[in-house]
């Protein structure tokens, strides 16, 4: 679809092309399974264009269908920590607030591996906060080429 000259001069956010790519900041304290994310040019190859961070969690500011993607690599990894017979070691991405919209969007398990990755298209609404929960005793890598999380607005 061709853009008019006026549209070409508008920032991407105003066209609805919200996009974010985040890197891991830290894990939560005991009893908090959430991963806490950070983004911005000063941190390297991470950025937010439209979505925003709320206490390390990604908040959507524009309704639409989004591509959500995530990769997590474990810094402490062993055959036991990734075995189904050990702890339930899963990564779940979901809408955690508002409570009325709470739902799991992605669920992945570490099966004999140190890295998991997935993506999906899903409708998201303004105000949705996405949480990434890592269950089990796991320590993810903070290397930016190993652990990252992002969203990309695709269409209304």
């Amino acid at each position: 679809q061709r853009l008019s000259r006026a549209q070409q001069q508008l920032p991407l956010e105003s066209l609805g092309w919200d996009i974010a790519e985040l890197q891991l900041n830290h894990t939560g304290p005991q009893q908090d399974p959430r991963l806490y994310w950070q983004g911005g040019p000063a941190l390297g190859r991470s950025f937010l264009r439209g979505p925003e961070l709320d206490k390390g969690q990604l908040r959507i500011r524009r309704d639409g269908i989004y591509m959500v993607h995530i990769q997590v690599t474990l810094a402490i990894c062993s055959s036991t920590s990734t075995s189904r017979h050990h702890h339930p070691t899963t990564l779940a991405v979901g809408i955690c607030s508002p409570a009325s919209r709470s739902i799991s969007l992605l669920r992945l398990s570490f099966h004999q591996g140190c890295t998991i990755a997935s993506q999906r298209l899903t409708p998201l609404a303004r105000g949705d906060t996405l949480c990434t929960n890592l269950t089990g005793t796991l320590l993810p890598s903070r290397n930016t080429d190993e652990t990252f999380f992002g969203v990309q607005w695709v269409r209304p």
């Epitope: 939560g28 005991q30 005793t137």
Partner: antibody, heavy 120, light 108 residues
């Protein structure tokens, strides 16, 4: 300047307990995972235990699992190792060590170590 | 558990000579996650190399690491008097994180 200072070592009888401490300074303690590594006299280095920066994740070598407990107090910039049911083979110099920012357990700073001797 | 075997046990060399230290793993190390440390008597280990070949902050460029899979090498291009010490390799690709038992570099 990053500094790690261990304390709490000493002579203890088999079956006894000891609590090691590691006081950290010169870096944002809560940001970094930490480990304990030990070295028996004239022997190889052995990784003992690790803990995430937030304290939410703890990890142990099989040789100490169920006997040792790693913990941290980020408000005091201090790492701990509670050692119970001590055995003669636990005799070693115990080092606290800071993980790289990536969280991977290679150790860019070490303390000077504290000697634990388990003997009757 | 990955077993790391270091050789030789002792290396007798003179200052200015080249030192080549070997570390062999019992199985392939994930992503070449191998580190090298230097330890002098009565001191804590000091990180030299991580990721098999990346020099740690402040480490002189006479120290270099190489290798992949199961075979790794630490090279000291020209030995300085302060380089005589024990050198350990460590794998951190898989728990438990294991160390080799060291190579002692001594003055000939």
């Amino acid at each position: 300047e990053v500094q790690l200072l261990e304390s709490g070592g000493g002579l203890v009888q088999p079956g006894g307990s000891l609590r090691l401490s590691c006081a950290a300074s010169g870096f944002t303690f809560s940001t970094y995972a930490m480990s304990w590594v030990r070295q028996a006299p004239g022997k190889c280095l052995e990784w003992v235990s690790a803990i995430s920066g937030s304290g939410g994740g703890t990890f142990y070598a099989e040789s100490v699992k169920g006997r040792f407990t790693i913990s941290r107090d980020n408000s005091k910039n201090t790492l701990y190792l509670q050692m119970n049911s001590l055995r003669a083979e636990d005799t070693a110099v115990y080092y606290c060590a800071k993980h790289d920012y990536s969280n991977y357990p290679y150790f860019d700073y070490w303390g000077q170590g504290t000697l634990v001797t388990v003997s009757s | 558990e990955i077993v790391l075997t270091q050789s030789p046990g002792t290396l007798s060399l003179s200052p200015g000579e080249r030192a080549t230290l070997s570390c062999r793993a019992s199985q392939s190390i994930r992503s070449n996650y191998l580190a090298w440390y230097q330890q002098k008597p009565g001191q804590a280990p000091r990180l030299l190399i991580y990721g098999a070949s990346s020099r740690a902050t402040g480490i002189p460029d006479r120290f270099s690491g190489s290798g992949s899979g199961t075979d790794f090498t630490l090279t000291i291009s020209r030995l300085e008097p302060e380089d005589f010490a024990v050198y350990y390799c460590q794998q951190y690709g898989s728990s438990p994180f294991t160390f080799g038992c060291g190579t002692k570099v001594e003055i000939k």
